[in-house]
Interface confidence: low
């Protein structure tokens, strides 16, 4: 999916509002110097490209991410602020559909969403930040 | 291994002309923006010039305004810092520096070379 | 153009914390970068965009940034801390970038 043609403040205005919260609270009881930061992005779009891979594509160790509340939230967000965006989503909603039980939060995937939350904050970056 | 290596100093009468120059190597010098800061004897850190990665724009320091001009070859990986009517108060050690680029604002200095001394006197 | 303002030296014992204040009018409002300078070398980014920092400087360095002055703070101070300190923003309105005039840390 190309997200050129998302509303990014309004995506922004998502993370700001809830998103973030949801990902300290996935974080919380982990130091915020045990990961380092390995994935960046260089623009608006390309950090959603980079999101969305991160959040809802499963990788060695990390399977679940998709389930949790951020994931929930970012899909929202990208299906309403994004067009055409939840067209591409079907197969992955129907996956969901299917989940089980939230696991263990893995070491593996505290990393993963400490990668996302440097993504957001790329993301969001503002040119002159607001008071 | 990321490095940035300065060129080109010296001893320049006022008035005069010097060109400076600086060889990227390590990494992608196309996708940063690239900045000249100096320092002189004694004194704290003066930042000098930026131009954007791709070198569609420049920015400069008043005190410099007019009479330095930055360019870059990509090609080259080269950063370039041309100085014009040079006077005493340019006697500084010049750096050459690497920010990652973020839209249109600069970003911290992660790279910074030695530094290529500039002394202007008569 | 904007102006930032730092003390010009702080003492710190070993062990202790030092604190480096950067003043700038609402530098709330910026994102603001730290460097450490040690006689006869090139700076070194310690502290980017208020309060991350980069790889291989140690979690003894931090920062912060509200209202009209950011920080820099060094927990359990070491002789080889003993630096210049720089602070920095990009002020967007003149296209310039924007260094303190320094801080000269002394461990005792």
């Known amino acids: 999916y190309d997200f050129t043609n998302c509303d990014f403040e309004k995506i922004k205005a998502a993370y700001l509002s809830t998103i973030s919260k949801d990902l300290i609270t996935y974080m919380s009881g982990t130091k915020s110097t045990e990961f380092n930061n390995t994935v960046s992005c260089s623009n608006r779009p390309h950090c959603l490209t980079e999101i969305q891979s991160l959040t809802f594509n499963p990788t060695a160790g990390c399977a679940s991410l998709a389930k949790e509340m951020f994931a929930m939230k970012t899909k929202a967000a990208l299906a309403i602020w994004c067009p055409g965006y939840s067209e591409t989503q079907i197969n992955a909603t129907q996956a969901m559909k299917k989940r089980r039980k939230r696991k263990v939060t893995t070491n593996k995937c505290l990393e993963q969403v400490s990668q996302l939350q440097g993504l957001w904050r790329r993301f969001n970056r503002p040119l002159l930040k607001q008071q | 291994q990321m490095q940035l290596v300065e060129s080109g100093g010296g001893v320049v009468q006022p008035g005069r002309s010097l060109r400076l120059s600086c060889a990227a190597s390590g990494f992608a010098f196309r996708t940063y923006g690239m900045h000249w800061v100096r320092q002189a004897p004694g004194k704290g850190l003066e930042w000098v010039a930026v131009?954007?990665?791709?070198?569609?724009?420049?920015h400069y320091a008043d005190s410099v305004k007019g009479r330095f001009t930055i360019t870059r070859d990509n090609s080259k990986n080269t950063l370039n810092l041309q100085m014009n009517s040079l006077r005493a108060e340019d006697t500084a050690v010049y750096y050459c520096v690497r920010a990652p680029q973020w839209y249109l604002s600069a970003e911290a200095f992660d790279l910074w070379g030695q530094g290529t001394m500039v002394t202007v006197s008569s | 153009s904007y102006v930032l303002t730092q003390p010009p030296s702080v003492s710190v014992a070993p062990g202790e914390t030092a604190t480096i204040t950067c003043g700038g009018n609402l530098i709330g409002a910026y994102l603001v970068h730290w460097y450490q300078q040690k006689p006869g070398q090139a700076p070194v980014l310690v502290i980017y965009?208020?309060?991350d920092r980069p790889a291989r400087i140690p979690e003894r360095f931090s920062g912060s940034n509200s209202g009209n002055t950011a920080t820099l703070t060094i927990s359990r101070v070491e002789a080889g801390d003993e630096a210049d300190y720089y602070c920095?923003?990009?002020?967007?309105?003149?296209?310039?970038?924007?260094f303190g005039g320094g801080t000269k840390l002394t461990v005792l």
């Open positions: 965009d208020d309060v």
């Open positions: 920095q923003v990009w002020d967007h309105d003149t296209n310039t970038m924007v």
């Open positions: 131009i954007w990665y791709d070198g569609s724009a420049t």
